[in-house]
């Protein structure tokens, strides 16, 4: 029978007599930076080229006995998870190993840097097809290690790393905290976060997604035919490296941004029990478990978007938080969230020639998050239209007036400390799909985009008495680009997108003592690209993703 | 994911006049910074990655490394250049006393210096 972890990442259409998905990643080379490995193990023989790269510290302790099988244990297992004949994810992928961890599984930031440099030089000397670099290691936050990862990613290399096994915020570790790296947490057979002794998988906004990482069967260095079960975020990262190799083999021209969006899109949604995570991390941690796409064809017809949370602003009165999209993603909307509800909204602004999302803390607030909706929208031309606070008693409004531009997101930002005390409430004008409205004391920012075949519509869901949470989702075939709340009063904590659902959180009315009867409305902007759909159908005849992908559309409520 | 340089220990050494006139002052208004791992047991003092500004050429990296060695020697310190980086980041890896950090941070082209630290299999 197929191991649980391979079954979990395999879409139903592949679950035939045995696990043998089409194309095993044969066009892709996966670099593994780890311990030494037993490259002639039956599971991986001929699949792993051991490079002559070695940069490891001496083992600790005078009584340490170097035992070959122990030295090779971690790396051999991971090589097997990525490309093993019987228990591997990408059975056709070829691998190259670099030794940066010693027999105790310990290495250095400097050794890892030199390893990454070795890969870059190899790539320049002999350019091959797509490269995936697997970093199943973690240290403390390192500016230099993150910078090296960024440079390698910008050279077209896909880096996948372990989130870390410290039951902690992954942003405190490197390379897990590098934005360009795909950071993977670990889940078990019950889709629960993995517990490892007193610790467990890391979590938080620096994790991109989770993957199987407990009781993973793979090659054991104890003998040439042995298998062993190992657990950790390294094993989870190895699954994603394998999935990435499969995807890149099917579509070798995919960019890092496109690959990351596809990994997120094809993940199982909302299956992880979030109660395991600390309360303040639940909203920040992606509820995604990696899976292979249900088809080897591209998914080019889809408009892909993901949600990127900023670091916490900190509590000072003028503190701000910034969320950024990857270089080849478009920022289509910007929202903000504060656990205390004390915030002054958010705005999209240009920084270094690119739009960023900035959220503003308010006096007495514990801090805010900025939440960017980052999308793949080829040939897009996006701009921000701003309306200053209105003088009139009605609300502020702004719309996309340029020909062919459509509204993809609304933001509002205010200078007053508490909008809730400023009446009257905003009444949203109906039948204005290309218009953002807001409180008269707020400035309103509309994200307006022109892209071939782009069409968007506004969807709202209002609940009369304040609820802790209001959601509205986009229908099948449409992608959530914008998520905001109406009105921006003090009991609204903020709005954010989770998969294709817009979530508006409000303060628990029982604790605030508010008697406001004001409705809270979640406003979603849902878009699709007819251009992408047509281009994809011309390439493939027609796409077969739509029907098969239904099992991914669970909705995620916090 | 983490983008700013928060969430870890940063030591910014404010630099006064260029000591002994030996080091060229960094470009006006820029101060090289020193970083080290926030998790003390994982620190590896005595080995440092000196990261140079983005457009620095290999020859300048080598020259900067030699300059550091020469200035350290004048002060009676032994240093060893373990690796010169190029291809990903310009810079070099040096084994030296922490006493030399202030001197190293004043070298031309230096963007920041990071103390080496441990990484672990996960």
């Amino acid at each position: 029978s197929i191991p649980w972890n391979l079954e979990r990442i395999t879409p139903p259409r592949y679950r035939a007599d045995e696990y043998q998905p089409p194309d095993g990643g044969s066009l892709v080379e996966v670099y593994l930076l780890d311990t030494s490995i037993q490259s002639d193990h039956r599971e991986i023989e001929g699949r792993v080229m051991v490079t002559d790269f070695e940069n490891v510290p001496e083992e600790d302790g005078t009584r340490f006995h170097r035992q070959a099988s122990k030295c090779d244990s971690h790396g051999t297992h991971l090589a097997g998870v990525v490309s093993g004949r019987d228990a591997g994810v990408a059975k056709g992928a070829s691998m190259r190993s670099l030794r940066v961890l010693n027999c105790q599984g310990k290495g250095t930031v400097s050794g890892t840097l030199i390893g990454l440099e070795f890969i870059r030089k190899s790539q320049l000397v002999q350019p091959v097809g797509p490269l995936v670099v697997l970093l199943p290691l973690a240290g403390g936050y390192s500016r230099v290690l993150n910078a090296a990862c960024q440079r390698l990613a910008r050279a077209g290399v896909v880096l996948v790393t372990a989130a870390g096994n410290f039951r902690d915020d992954a942003c405190l570790y490197s390379p897990a905290s590098a934005p360009e790296v795909i950071t993977v947490g670990a889940t078990n057979a019950q889709d629960q976060p993995v517990t490892l002794g007193t610790l467990g998988t890391n979590f938080g906004r620096c994790v991109d997604l989770f993957a199987p990482g407990e009781d993973i069967i793979g090659a054991s260095s104890d003998c040439s035919t042995c298998f062993v079960s190992q657990s950790g975020t390294s094993q989870a990262a190895a699954h994603v490296a394998g999935i990435a190799a499969m995807m890149l083999s099917a579509e070798p021209e995919l960019t890092l941004a496109e690959l990351r969006q596809r990994l997120i899109h094809f993940s199982a949604k909302d299956v992880i029990n979030e109660a395991w995570f600390p309360e303040d991390q639940r909203v920040l941690t992606p509820n995604l478990v990696a899976a292979l796409p249900p088809s080897t064809h591209g998914a080019g017809w889809q408009l892909f978007c993901r949600t990127v949370w900023s670091a916490h602003s900190g509590p000072t009165r003028m503190a701000t938080a910034i969320a950024r999209c990857a270089p080849d993603e478009e920022l289509l909307s910007c929202s903000s969230f504060s656990r205390s509800g004390k915030r002054r909204g958010e705005r999209m602004e240009a920084q270094g020639g690119k739009l960023v999302c900035r959220a503003h803390n308010a006096f007495g607030g514990e801090g805010v998050y900025a939440i960017a909706r980052c999308c793949l929208l080829p040939q897009a031309n996006c701009s921000v239209h701003t309306a200053p606070p209105a003088e009139a008693s009605m609300g502020t409004e702004v719309h996309c007036h340029q020909q062919g531009h459509v509204l993809t997101g609304c933001s509002s930002h205010w200078e007053v400390e508490d909008l809730g005390t400023h009446k009257p409430p905003v009444l949203r004008p109906r039948g204005q799909p290309n218009q953002c409205v807001g409180h008269r004391e707020a400035s309103i920012h509309a994200s307006c985009c022109h892209a071939p075949g782009l069409e968007c519509k506004v969807k709202e869901h209002g609940i009369p008495a304040p609820q802790e949470q209001v959601t509205v989702a986009c229908e099948e075939g449409w992608t959530l680009t914008g998520c905001s709340a109406l009105p921006g009063t003090s009991h609204v904590l903020g709005a954010y997108a989770v998969d294709n659902t817009c979530v508006v959180r409000s303060r628990d009315v029982s604790t605030t003592g508010s008697t406001s009867e004001e409705a809270v409305t979640a406003v979603a902007i849902c878009c699709r690209s007819r251009h992408l759909a047509q281009a994809s159908q011309e390439l493939q005849g027609s796409s077969d993703y739509k029907d098969d992908d239904k099992h991914h559309h669970h909705h995620h409520h916090h | 994911q983490e983008d700013e340089d928060g969430d870890y220990e940063e030591l910014v050494l404010a630099l006064r006049s260029e000591e002994d006139g030996l080091a060229e002052a960094p470009e006006h208004g820029t101060t090289a910074t020193f970083h080290r791992c926030a998790k003390d047991p994982w620190r590896l003092p005595g080995t440092y990655v000196v990261v140079l500004k983005e457009e620095t050429h290999l020859s300048q990296s080598e020259r900067t490394a030699r300059r550091l060695q020469a200035q350290a020697a004048r002060r009676g310190y032994l240093t060893k250049i373990l690796h010169v980086f190029h291809g990903l980041l310009p810079g070099f890896l040096v084994k030296m006393s922490g006493d030399l950090l202030e001197l190293a941070l004043k070298l031309p082209h230096v963007d920041y210096i990071e103390e080496d630290s441990s990484v672990f299999a996960q």
Epitope: E18, Q20, Q38, S39, D40, R42, E45, G46, V48, M49, V50, A68, R85, D86, K91, C223, S224, T225 | -
Partner: antibody, heavy 115, light 110 residues
Amino acid sequence: QVQLVQSGAEVKKPGASVKVSCKASGYTLTSYGISWVRQAPGQGLEWMGWVSFYNGNTNYAQKLQGRGTMTTDPSTSTAYMELRSLRSDDTAVYYCARGYGMDVWGQGTTVTVSS
Amino acid sequence: QSALTQPASVSGSPGQSITISCTGTSSDVGGYNSVSWYQQHPGKAPKLMIYEVSNRPSGVSNRFSGSKSGNTASLTISGLQAEDEADYYCNSYTSTSMVFGGGTKLTVLQ
């Protein structure tokens, strides 16, 4: 190109030992071990065992346990198979093949055990 | 462990297709993705024709194909040619070793 070159034919008396060599070339030695397979006259193929160039580890077929020894010498890229206490039913062609996948084979070494 | 079961002989005329079966257990053929097929002409070393159930090494004609269902693997040769006349052996992993089939003699009828 990838090649396995075996030593020449041997004629041995019952009770004696034989040591067959197999020199590998054209690939990264440590990525594959060497399998040994034999074929008695008019019979099928029989897997005897495997030996590692990486660390010298071995994996013997149960039938061979105790009578055979497989070794490697990475410095000369050569694998060896020694069979002791030879019997007449050990008369066979002995092949070395690359790895467990046995994708490349040596030309075979004929061992005749006869009194 | 005992050898995998193959038919002792099969035959076919030029241009025809033939299939050779290889039956094992869930501990060998059924339990692994690593079933291989070898061709051996008289007095020659075996040659790998199919590996990992259905993959063909470069240089092997696409007339040769492999498949597996449950505990039985199959080798199919289409468009039979005179030079295909040889002995064919299947091989599979077991938990700790390797096992061959007894071999099948393929005769191409003239």
